[in-house]
């Protein structure tokens, strides 16, 4: 029968030793057994469980010429990059005949400098704004005490006496560095150094100061920027139609914004080259040497209507007896608003001017009072919006109507029964 089949007689002549070290350690556990006959396969146990995918070796050396003589078997188990999960009790196990033999245990322990599970991260914060930093370390050995440092200066008299996992900073007025030291019985480990960059606070109270059809004057109140003066502020404006959906928190508009920079102070800016009678959304951010603040929420604004920038086009005026036919086309120049209608003025030599509101029609027939012999009759037309009248056209003389000349379809506009060339009647 193979050696070691009696329960009281173990085949193991060398048992696993102990390994204690820091994270990352590479170590080897060994066991040796002497058996008679065919050498068995050696298995490794950790805390009583077989390690299925162990990185192991096995050497078998015969002690005699005959296969039935004794063999020395050496098994080695590699622990690569020691972690907490590798710690525990290790044993070798062999099956010999109908019996199972287990070696004496060896122990693998983790003991070294503290190991960081969480370290402070770089971040940006607004001036004088509270924030938290996190740091977490573990042994073994425990306990692990933390000591926070700001700009390399300890924030407590000794490790474990100040804040531990979370450091609450009520606010900063200058860019600072933070790190934490983890102390245990083995020594000290220092975390990475986090840079906390102090940016200006978000500007407040963005509002309109004045409105013109093509420009808006806006102002805002700057936020605190710590020890760093503001270098400039940036204003963005974007066209907004009703369906655009810029909400208070929506990060970016769907189209390229118009961007303007403002020297500061004053915290005011005139935005020009805008479209009249158009809704916009505007926002502002201010910058110091450390970087820009966050943007304000989008503020909806609207440019007011302006007057049309040009007169109606292609005015023609013809006269046939006591009737005058006048027609025109919409101004080619921008209307700067919603066209509400046209005003027409006509005047004869040495007679007062007559003003009429034609509405949105682009033609009119005038019933002239009297014998129609008034000389040098001229007509002017202007377009208007809610903001007022645009420029008048140049005077157009009434030409005599010639047979065969097309006459526009029109609706007669008769002057009321008042003397010819009366003052406006609208």
């Amino acid at each position: 029968a193979p050696r070691g089949t009696q329960a009281e007689e173990s085949p193991f002549v060398g048992n696993p030793g102990n390994i204690t070290g820091a994270r990352g350690l590479t170590g080897t556990l060994r066991c040796q057994l002497q058996v008679q006959g065919e050498p068995p396969e050696v298995h490794w146990l950790r805390d009583g469980q077989i390690l299925e995918l162990a990185d192991s070796t096995q050497t078998q050396v015969p002690l005699g010429e005959d296969e039935q003589d004794d063999w020395i078997v050496v098994s080695q188990l590699r622990i690569t990059s020691l972690q907490l999960s590798d710690t525990g009790q290790y044993q070798c196990l062999v099956f010999l005949g109908h019996q199972t033999f287990v070696s004496q245990p060896g122990y693998v322990g983790l003991e070294g400098l503290p190991y960081f599970l969480e370290e402070p991260e770089d971040r940006t914060v607004a001036a004088n704004t509270p924030f938290n930093l996190s740091c977490q370390a573990q042994g073994p050995p425990e306990p692990v005490d933390l000591l926070w440092l700001q700009d390399a200066v300890p924030l407590a008299t000794a490790p474990g006496h100040g804040p531990q996992r979370s450091l609450h900073v009520p606010g900063l007025n200058k860019t600072s560095s933070f790190s934490c030291e983890a102390h245990n019985a083995k020594g000290v480990t220092t975390s990475r150094t986090a840079t906390i960059t102090v940016l200006p606070q978000q500007p407040r109270n963005l509002h309109l100061v004045s409105r013109q059809p093509t420009e808006l004057e806006v102002a805002w109140t700057p936020g605190l920027s710590g020890i760093y003066p503001l270098t400039h502020c940036t204003l963005q404006a974007v066209l907004s139609d009703d369906g655009m959906g810029i909400q208070a928190g929506e990060p970016d508009p769907p189209e390229e914004p118009l961007t303007s920079q403002a020297s500061v102070p004053p915290h005011q800016l005139r935005l020009g080259s805008l479209h009249p009678h158009t809704p916009y959304h505007i926002r502002v951010a201010c910058t110091s040497s450390q970087g820009p603040s966050s943007w304000t929420h989008w503020l909806p604004v609207e440019t007011p209507e302006g007057v049309p920038l040009g007169p109606p086009e292609n005015i023609s005026a013809t006269r046939n007896g006591s009737q005058a036919f006048v027609h025109w086309q919409e101004p080619r120049a921008p209307l700067q608003g919603t066209l509400l209608g046209y005003r027409l003025a006509y005047q004869g030599q040495d007679t007062p001017e007559v003003l009429m509101d034609i509405g949105l029609r682009q033609e009119v027939t005038l019933e002239l009072q009297g014998d129609g012999s008034v000389s040098n009759l001229t007509v002017c037309v202007a377009a208007y919006t809610a903001a007022g009248d645009g420029p008048w056209s140049l005077p157009v003389p009434l030409e005599a109507w010639r047979p065969g000349q097309a006459q526009p379809v029109h609706q007669l506009v008769k002057e009321p029964s008042t003397p010819a060339f009366s003052w406006p009647w609208w």
């Epitope: 030793g17 070290g21 590479t26 066991c31 990185d55 050497t59 078998q60 080695q76 070294g112 400098l113």
Partner: antibody, heavy 121, light 107 residues
């Protein structure tokens, strides 16, 4: 007598593949770890990876992970280094080496006591 | 990865001189340090393992010492066959890493 003999080196284009062999004799092939170490021309030594031929458990350096594969055939007492997606910076003499087995119930670390003659890639 | 920094990178010495090469680890590696000798066109040879243990067949003029982060290889009386490049190697953590080498030349 312990011996390790590498073969399979040669000239290869970037992106190409090559398989190196390391034939072992004179010791228990399953009783240790076989390491691959390389040395770029005029430079120092760089570890590539290891394998325990017994458990066929490889471990790699980050610089070759995903491109190189280490394997072993215990019936031939041979370890292999399959190199794919080769780069100019992989140019080196490649050595296989036997890990020196310390004694006692445990040890930390290891050393390499027998080395092959090297093969140039 | 642990960095191993050897100094000096080269030195000139005469036969019979006592030569000391140092190796510094970027973190504690206990005694998991080996020293190798390499001659041009040849494979490295193991001299010292576990920081201070002389490998079988290596002349006793070679010795190693140190633990933690600072290690030393000493050749008590330099011989003509000792002119070579020497490397330290840590194996405390994976990957094992080597020093950049120290070339010992004839003065």
């Amino acid at each position: 007598e312990v011996q390790l003999v590498e073969s399979g080196g040669g000239l290869v284009q970037p992106g190409g593949s090559l398989r190196l062999s390391c034939a072992a004799s004179g010791f228990s092939f399953t009783g240790t770890w076989i390491h691959w170490v390389r040395q770029a021309p005029g430079k120092g030594l760089e570890w590539v990876g290891w394998i325990a031929p017994y458990s066929r458990h490889p471990y790699y350096a980050d610089s070759v992970k995903g491109r190189f594969t280490i394997s072993a055939d215990t019936s031939k007492n041979t370890a292999y280094l399959q190199m794919n997606s080769l780069r100019a910076e992989d140019t080196a003499v490649y050595y296989c080496a036997r890990e020196y087995s310390g004694w006692g119930g445990s040890s930390v670390g290891y050393a390499m006591d027998y080395w092959g003659q090297g093969t140039l890639v | 990865d642990i960095q191993m920094t050897q100094s000096p990178s080269s030195l000139s010495a005469s036969v019979g001189d006592r030569v000391t090469i140092t190796c510094r680890a970027s973190q504690d590696v206990s005694t998991a340090v080996a020293w190798y000798q390499q001659k041009p066109g040849k494979a490295p040879k193991l001299l010292i393992y576990s920081a201070s243990f002389l490998y079988s067949g290596v002349p006793s003029r070679f010795s190693g010492s140190g633990s933690g982060t600072d290690f030393t290889l000493t050749i008590s009386s330099l011989q003509p066959e000792d002119f070579a490049t020497y490397y330290c190697q840590q194996s405390y953590t994976t990957p094992p890493t080597f020093g950049q080498g120290t070339k010992v030349e004839i003065k």
